[in-house]
């Protein structure tokens, strides 16, 4: 059976970025079209064939080149990827005898956690303030050494594209965590960082 | 530096047989379109037969069924087998490398080896 | 297949005046909005040299003095200004369909 293989790739913001397409049981394409998806029709943004060789649309001139130059594997790369980058995109190969057989690669852009942990004595209680920005939206959990502490979460999404999550512990007799290791965890894209503060009286 | 060397031209007989071979260095052979061209003893150019990257091959009607073009990737030569050779085929036979992000233009090419058809 | 026809088939111009030669097309050579032709230059001796690709674009390397313009079926190669240098022919070559065809050349010299 004729088909196109192809998978989705995770890349970190302004970093480069590569989607292939593999035309599986089938001879070399005539020609190999990139498109991306959008909401009304899809956009040409480059092109490969024997006789015309790369052939990029204006608007992806100095953002994409097709890296792996093949009519049965082709590579897009993207140098720099940024927001307006995440989405799907297809790769249409035109053959003879089959007609065009078409494949989905999505990009999905992320940025790593930015974490700031720091706390605040008052009177009669300590707030510890973990904060963390990152695309997609982080977690923030809490170890500490004793149960029962309170905690409040607020979320805010940027205009960015990222997302950050704020998480304060609310400690209402603060002398008792004096010298003692407060954790706050951020989990990510399934990894978990530990991020560690140990509370001094000031 | 991108070099590329032909060799194997001669005085050939006509309906007779020759290779071709071109040997390429200073880039990766095999990413690239690689193609024979020739220039008549009027200086006419003419493009004789092209090797994708892929492998797919291409040639002149006039040449179909005469000319078979080839290539060693992990020698970087280019080959061009001609047989039954007419005086019209009597040329200088350059290799030439098609860049496929400038249009497939011939971008380098070899000093060029010369055969002759004639009897 | 598509013919190619360069006009003049040689001129002579002065040394830092411009020349400029003519490739028509007997059919369009454009697709997906680029027009597949390109020029070159071959001295006497030597094979030829990439000098324009895609109608417009300056081969690296190539002096700014020449430059490509045209698009569908008619193209020029302009150099301004000559120098001695240049005393050459000059071929246009289209890729946008097999057989890839060239011009019959121009041959320029320095008057």
């Known amino acids: 059976q004729v088909q196109v293989v192809t998978q989705d790739e995770r890349e970190q913001l302004y970093t480069p970025a590569s989607l292939k397409c593999s035309l599986q049981n089938a001879q070399e394409a005539l020609i190999v079209t990139w498109q991306k998806k959008k909401a009304v029709s899809p956009e040409n943004m480059v092109t490969f064939s024997e006789n015309h060789g790369v052939v990029i649309q204006p608007a992806y001139k100095d953002k994409i080149n097709i890296t792996q130059l093949g009519l049965q594997n082709s590579t897009i790369t993207f140098w720099n990827i940024t927001l307006e980058d995440e989405g799907c995109y297809m790769c249409l190969f035109n053959t003879f005898g089959f007609g065009k057989i078409s494949g989905t690669a999505c990009l999905t852009v992320y940025v790593q956690p930015i974490v700031s942990l720091h706390y605040k004595f008052s009177e009669d209680h300590l707030n510890i303030t973990c904060s963390a920005t990152a695309r997609p939206a982080p977690m923030v959990f809490w170890k500490v050494p004793r149960s029962g502490i309170e905690n409040s979460t607020v979320t805010l999404s940027h205009p960015n594209g990222t997302t950050s999550v704020t998480s304060i512990l609310h400690i209402k007799d603060p002398k008792n965590q004096v010298g003692k290791e407060v954790i706050c965890q951020v989990l990510h894209l399934g990894t978990v960082t530990d991020f560690k503060q140990t509370v001094n009286k000031g | 530096e991108v070099k590329l060397v032909e060799s194997g031209g001669g005085l050939v007989k006509p309906g007779g047989s020759l290779k071709l071979s071109c040997a390429a260095s200073g880039f990766t052979f095999s990413g690239f379109a690689m193609s024979w061209v020739r220039q008549t003893p009027e200086k006419r150019l003419e493009w004789v037969a092209s090797i994708s990257s892929g492998g797919t091959t291409y040639y002149l009607d006039s040449v179909k069924g005469r000319f078979t073009i080839s290539r060693d990737i992990a020698r970087n030569i280019l080959y061009l087998q001609m047989s039954s050779l007419r005086s019209e085929d009597t040329a200088m036979y350059y290799c030439a490398r098609g860049n496929y992000y400038s249009g497939t233009s011939y971008d380098y090419w070899g000093q060029g080896t010369t055969l002759t058809v004639s009897s | 297949d598509i013919v190619l026809t360069q006009s003049p088939a040689s001129l002579a111009v002065s040394l830092g005046q411009r020349a400029t030669i003519s490739c028509r097309a007997s059919?369009?050579?454009?697709?997906?909005?680029?027009?597949?032709m390109h020029w070159y230059q071959q001295k006497p001796g030597q094979p030829p040299k990439l000098l324009i690709y895609r109608a417009s674009n300056l081969e690296s390397g190539i002096p700014a003095r020449f430059s490509g313009s045209g698009s569908r079926t008619d193209f020029t190669l302009t150099i301004n200004p000559v120098e001695a240098d240049d005393v050459a022919t000059y071929y246009c070559?289209?890729?946008?369909?097999?057989?890839?065809?060239f011009g019959g050349g121009t041959k320029l010299e320095i008057k």
């Open positions: 070559q289209q890729s946008n369909e097999d057989p890839r065809t």
């Open positions: 059919e369009s050579v454009d697709s997906y909005g680029n027009s597949f």
